[in-house]
Interface confidence: low
C-alpha cells in the first residue's frame, strides 16, 4: 500500500486581522494510526497550535469531524487572527506509540496577516519658528502588515516633496512601523495652514488614513510697529498711537517709554483678527506737553510671545506748545481696537 502523504494544498493564505484563517490539510491514508498536530514554525522552537489527541486550543476549531475514525481531513480554522499569528503552519502526522512519534509533515502553509496601520500621528517642532524658516514635521504609523505602504505629505492640499521615510524593521516581521520627516518652509500666511500626512495601505481599500498638524501651533509672525502723532485732542495734550500689526500668536506686551522712562505697560487683550489669522492691536498715549520743557522721545516697545523686545520711537516736538512751570507729566494710556 502506498505510504501516507500529508497534503497542504495552499502554499500561502492571507487574512485580515480579526478574521479567521482556514488552513487545509488532508492525509491520503488511515495508516499508520496516530494523531495529527499543527505547528507554527519548524525545528525545535516550533509552536504547537493544535493537537488532535489532547490539549485546550480555544481559538482553533476543526473544519470537519476529525474525531471520526475514517476522517482524513484535518483542516483547522484559527479565529481572531492578529499580526502575531503570521508564520508558516505545518500539519504533522504522528504514529501512535508511547510516546507518539512524528511520522510525516506537510509542506507548510504560510499565513500572512493584513493589519491596518494606526492613525498617523503628526508632530511639529517643539519651538515656534518665524516665516522664511524651514521646520520639520514627523509622521508615525504603526502595526501594519504587509510591509508595502505609501506615505505622502501635503500642505494645504499641495503635495510636498522634501521628506524622508523609513519603514522598520528592515527584515521580516509580523508588523511594521513607518516614520517620515518632512521639511516645510513657513510663510506669513501660514497661520491657517495645515500639514497633512497621508498613509495608503492595502488594508485600507483605497481610503487612506490622514494625520494633521496645524501650523498655528508652529508659526510665530512678528509684529510690525508704527508710531504716529494724532492731532491735539485738547489744549496741551497730544495723542500718540502705536499700531501693532500682523502678529501671531496673540501673546504680546506693550510698554510706553518717555525719554527712556517707563510710562505704562499693558497686555494685548481685545485684538482684531485679520483674514490670514494674524492680529492687529493699537495702543495710544496722551502726553501732556505742558509738563515738558524739551522735546520728548516716545518709544513703543513690544515683547511678542516671549521674544526679545522690538521698538519704534517718535520724537514729539514741544517747543510750539506753551509750558506750565512746575507741573508734572500727566499721561493716560489706553488700549483700543484698530478697526
Amino acid at each position: 500500500e502506498e505510504e501516507l502523504q500529508v497534503i497542504q494544498p495552499d502554499k500561502s493564505v492571507s487574512v485580515a486581522a480579526g478574521e479567521s484563517a482556514i488552513l487545509h490539510c488532508t492525509v491520503t491514508s488511515l495508516i499508520p494510526v496516530g494523531p495529527i498536530q499543527w505547528f507554527r514554525g519548524a525545528g525545535p522552537a516550533r509552536e504547537l497550535i493544535y493537537n488532535q489527541k489532547e490539549g485546550h486550543f480555544p481559538r482553533v476549531t476543526t473544519v470537519s469531524e476529525s474525531t471520526k475514525r475514517e476522517n482524513m481531513d484535518f483542516s483547522i480554522s484559527i479565529s481572531n487572527i492578529t499580526p502575531a499569528d503570521a508564520g508558516t503552519y505545518y500539519c504533522v502526522k504522528f504514529r501512535k506509540g508511547s510516546p507518539d512519534t512524528e511520522f510525516k509533515s506537510g509542506a507548510g502553509t504560510e499565513l500572512s496577516v493584513r493589519a491596518k496601520p494606526s492613525a498617523p500621528v503628526v508632530s511639529g517642532p517643539a519651538a515656534r519658528a518665524t516665516p522664511q524658516h524651514t521646520v520639520s514635521f514627523t509622521c508615525e504609523s504603526h502595526g501594519f502588515s504587509p510591509r508595502d505602504i505609501t506615505l505622502k505629505w501635503f500642505k494645504n492640499g499641495n503635495e510636498l516633496s522634501d521628506f524622508q521615510t523609513n519603514v522598520d524593521p528592515v527584515g521580516e516581521s509580523v508588523s511594521y512601523s513607518i516614520h517620515s520627516t518632512a521639511k516645510v518652509v513657513l510663510t506669513r500666511e501660514d497661520v491657517h495652514s495645515q500639514v497633512i500626512c497621508e498613509v495608503a495601505h492595502v488594508t485600507l481599500q483605497g481610503d487612506p488614513l490622514r494625520g494633521t498638524a496645524n501650523l498655528s501651533e508652529t508659526i510665530r509672525v512678528p509684529p510690525t510697529l508704527e508710531v504716529t502723532q494724532q492731532p491735539v485732542r485738547a489744549e496741551n495734550q497730544v495723542n500718540v498711537t502705536c499700531q501693532v500689526r500682523k502678529f501671531y500668536p496673540q501673546r504680546l506686551q506693550l510698554t510706553w517709554l518717555e525719554n527712556g522712562n517707563v510710562s505704562r505697560t499693558e497686555t494685548a487683550s481685545t485684538v482684531t483678527e485679520n483674514k490670514d489669522g494674524t492680529y492687529n492691536w493699537m495702543s495710544w498715549l496722551l502726553v501732556n506737553v505742558s509738563a515738558h520743557r524739551d522735546d520728548v522721545k516716545l518709544t513703543c516697545q513690544v515683547e511678542h510671545d516671549g521674544q526679545p523686545a522690538v521698538s519704534k520711537s517718535h520724537d514729539l516736538k514741544v517747543s510750539a506748545h506753551p509750558k506750565e512751570q512746575g507741573s508734572n507729566t500727566a499721561a493716560e494710556n489706553t488700549g483700543s481696537n484698530e478697526r
Partner: antibody, heavy 121, light 107 residues
Amino acid sequence: EVQMLESGGGLVQPGGSLRLSCAASGFTFSSYAMSWVRQAPGKGLEWVSAISGSGSSTHYADSVKGRFTISRDNSKNTLYLQMNSLRAEDTAVYYCAAYSGSYYYYGMDVWGQGTTVTVSS
Amino acid sequence: EIVMTQSPATLSVSPGERATLSCRASQSVSRNLAWYQQKSGQAPRLLIYGASTRATGIPARFSGSGSGTEFTLTISSLQSEDFAGYYCQQYNNWPYTFGQGTKLEIK
C-alpha cells in the same frame, strides 16, 4: 552571531567623566536604533538614552540630560556614552541595547552583558 | 514623564501554575509597551512588544495583553527557568520609562 560588548566602565570620583563604548557585530549596525539602559545595585532597570540608526536623533532621561551624550560611529559599529559631572547616583551596570529597527519602535531585542560604573570618593 | 507601576512587587507561584503580572501607565501609551525578563546577573531579554506580540524565540506560554493604561503579562504554565524579574517599558512618549519590576519566585 549577533553580539554587543560594552567597555569603559570603572571607578570614578564624583564630578568626573567616563566614556562607555559598545562594540556591535553580527548585524547591520547602522540599520538599528541603539540605547543605553542602566541598573543600580539591587534596583530596577532605568532607560538612559537612545539614538537613531543614522545618529540624527537622540533622546535622554531627565536624570542625565545635559550631563550625558550618546553618539555612534557606524563605520566602526560602535555606540558611545560620554558621561560628565558624574554623581554617586549614576553608579550602576550600564547595558547597551539594540532596537528592532532604525527608529525607536518595538522593544530592545539585543543586549550586551553590561559594564559597571562606580562613582565614589 | 509617564510613570509605569507594576504589581505585585513579588509574586510567589508554584511550577506548572499560571502567573499574571500587571503593569499600569500613568497615561495612555496605546499598545506601545514591551515586557522584559531578567535573570540574576544577566542582561534583560525581550519577551513581548506591541503589548501582545511575542519576540523571536519566546515560548508560547508567554502572552501579553492590554492597551491604553492597563497591561498584563501571563505565563500559562510556569517552568523552572521562568523564575526571574520582569519589567514593563513604555515606548510611546519620551523619555521611555520602565516599571519598577516584579520578582517572580518559586512558592
